[in-house]
Interface confidence: low
């Protein structure tokens, strides 16, 4: 089943997020992803937990998952590299790098996104953009076209309250508000973009979506700069 989602958002402007990727399993959308280099897509490690022997591919240049678009292209995956410390039962280190079978053909609708290397928290209240093909309502309706929503960053102290995530949010994670607008099932692995820079990746835990007391959790990419660089090298 798809992991993660966009609730309370709207359809994105077509191809305005050329870094956006759909990680697909046997031809169906599974998770979001973000193109970080010509031949590499960053996503969430938990996305491949259910993949087993299925065929994993990456769709780039897409707005609609089903309609023909000149910029769309499906790439095979040469290598999948989950973070070595990721584990099935925790949200920590939930990152995955997918090496495409060849360098992506870049153009206006396909382009890598710079990612944050400076390891400092995004200021609380900063509006960040999250996009994906995840479910758009609690009935589980899946969109065909890319959705997005702007979410304010939530400070870690609030996110770690007993009533919220009760201390689970380490310095390597960040939170965004989730009051009716939220990332959800099918959005996991997708980008949280603040000021035009990739700051976070949607985690793929089975969190309730759209509940303000259960903020969205995102893996801070800056905290994993050394690992990302080592894999991409």
């Amino acid at each position: 089943p798809p992991r993660g989602r966009i609730l309370g958002g709207r359809e994105a402007e077509a191809h305005a997020r050329p870094y956006m990727a759909s990680v697909q399993l046997n031809g169906a959308h599974l998770c979001g992803g973000v193109l970080v280099a010509e031949q590499w897509v960053l996503s969430a490690a938990h996305c491949l937990e259910d993949a087993a022997d299925g065929k994993v591919q990456v769709l780039l240049g897409a707005h609609s998952l089903s309609q023909p678009e000149p910029s769309k292209r499906l790439y095979d995956v040469l290598r999948a590299v989950p973070h070595p410390d990721s584990q099935p039962d925790t949200i920590d280190h939930d990152l995955l790098l997918l090496q495409l079978s060849e360098k992506a053909t870049l153009g206006p609708a396909v382009r890598p996104l710079p990612w944050q290397r400076v390891d400092r928290d995004v200021a609380p209240g900063t509006l960040c953009d999250v996009a994906g093909w995840g479910i758009v309502n609690h009935a589980g309706r899946r969109p065909d076209s890319l959705q997005h929503v702007l979410l304010p960053v939530l400070d870690r102290a609030t996110c770690n309250r007993r009533t919220h995530h009760d201390g689970a949010i380490t310095e390597r994670l960040m939170c965004a508000e989730s009051n009716r607008r939220d990332s959800c099932k099918g959005d996991s692995g997708g980008p949280l973009v603040c000021g035009g820079v990739l700051e976070g990746v949607v985690t793929s835990g089975s969190r309730v979506c759209g509940n303000r007391k259960k903020p969205g959790i995102y893996t801070r990419v800056a905290s994993y700069a050394a690992w990302i660089d080592s894999v991409l090298a």
Partner: antibody, heavy 117, light 107 residues
């Protein structure tokens, strides 16, 4: 090594505009934000704003919102700042500084702007 | 905007002395504080980032401490080349703001 080379001193009349440049080398220009800082003679430092050269996204100090315009040319790895409607208050040295690791860790040599009739 | 109040505004000390400059933020900035040194006629140079981390190439006689709203820069065993103006800067939220500076002179 990282270098930021700024354009030369400017002498301008009140009401005029100037555009200064900051050419980056020694790192991937599009991966890091470029900040601009003002220093009036004998005074302290003021943050003007930054640009993300990758997509041209800008963030300004409200104080400079109508004064400064930040742009960047990826092909030449050059950031620009245009100052408009100049007054004597704009006479200052303007620095570009890139935020690569932890703070504004690499600075240009500064561009001096003198506004005089 | 977050105000950064730096003190003292000027300071005179003898070679070999240990001196302390303080910076107070008008609201909590966690550890997002940097210290810069600007020698006369020169450009600012990063000394300390994230309140207490020494930037590459900076002598170990410089140290920083603090978190929240109160921060200090300490220079031990003052050297002639330390004559400069020192600025703190918060990186917690935009707009970034600097302290007013501390001008250090040798007695």
């Amino acid at each position: 090594q990282v270098q930021l080379q700024q354009s030369g001193a400017e002498l301008a009349k009140p009401g005029a505009s100037v555009k200064m440049s900051c050419k980056a080398s020694g790192y991937t220009f599009t991966n890091y934000w470029m900040h601009w800082v003002k220093q009036r003679p004998g005074q302290g430092l003021e943050w003007i704003g930054y640009i993300n050269p990758s997509i041209g996204y800008t963030e300004y100090n409200q104080k400079f919102k109508d004064k400064a315009t930040l742009t960047a040319d990826k092909s030449s790895s050059t950031a620009y700042m245009q100052l408009s409607s100049l007054t004597s208050e704009d006479s200052a040295v303007f620095y570009c500084a890139t935020f690569i690791y932890y703070a504004m860790d690499y600075w240009g040599q500064g561009t001096s702007v003198t506004v005089s009739s | 905007d977050i105000q950064m109040n730096q003190s003292p505004s000027s300071l005179s000390a003898s070679l070999g002395d240990t001196i302390t400059i303080t910076c107070h933020a008008s609201q909590n900035i966690n550890v997002w504080l940097s210290w810069y040194q600007q020698k006369p006629g020169n450009i600012p140079k990063l000394l300390i980032y994230k309140a207490s981390n020494l930037h590459t190439g900076v002598p170990s006689r410089f140290s920083g401490s603090g978190s929240g709203t109160g921060f200090t820069l300490t220079i031990s065993s003052l050297q002639p080349e330390d004559i400069a103006t020192y600025y703190c800067q918060q990186g917690q939220s935009y707009p970034y703001t600097f302290g007013g500076g501390t001008k250090l002179e040798i007695k």
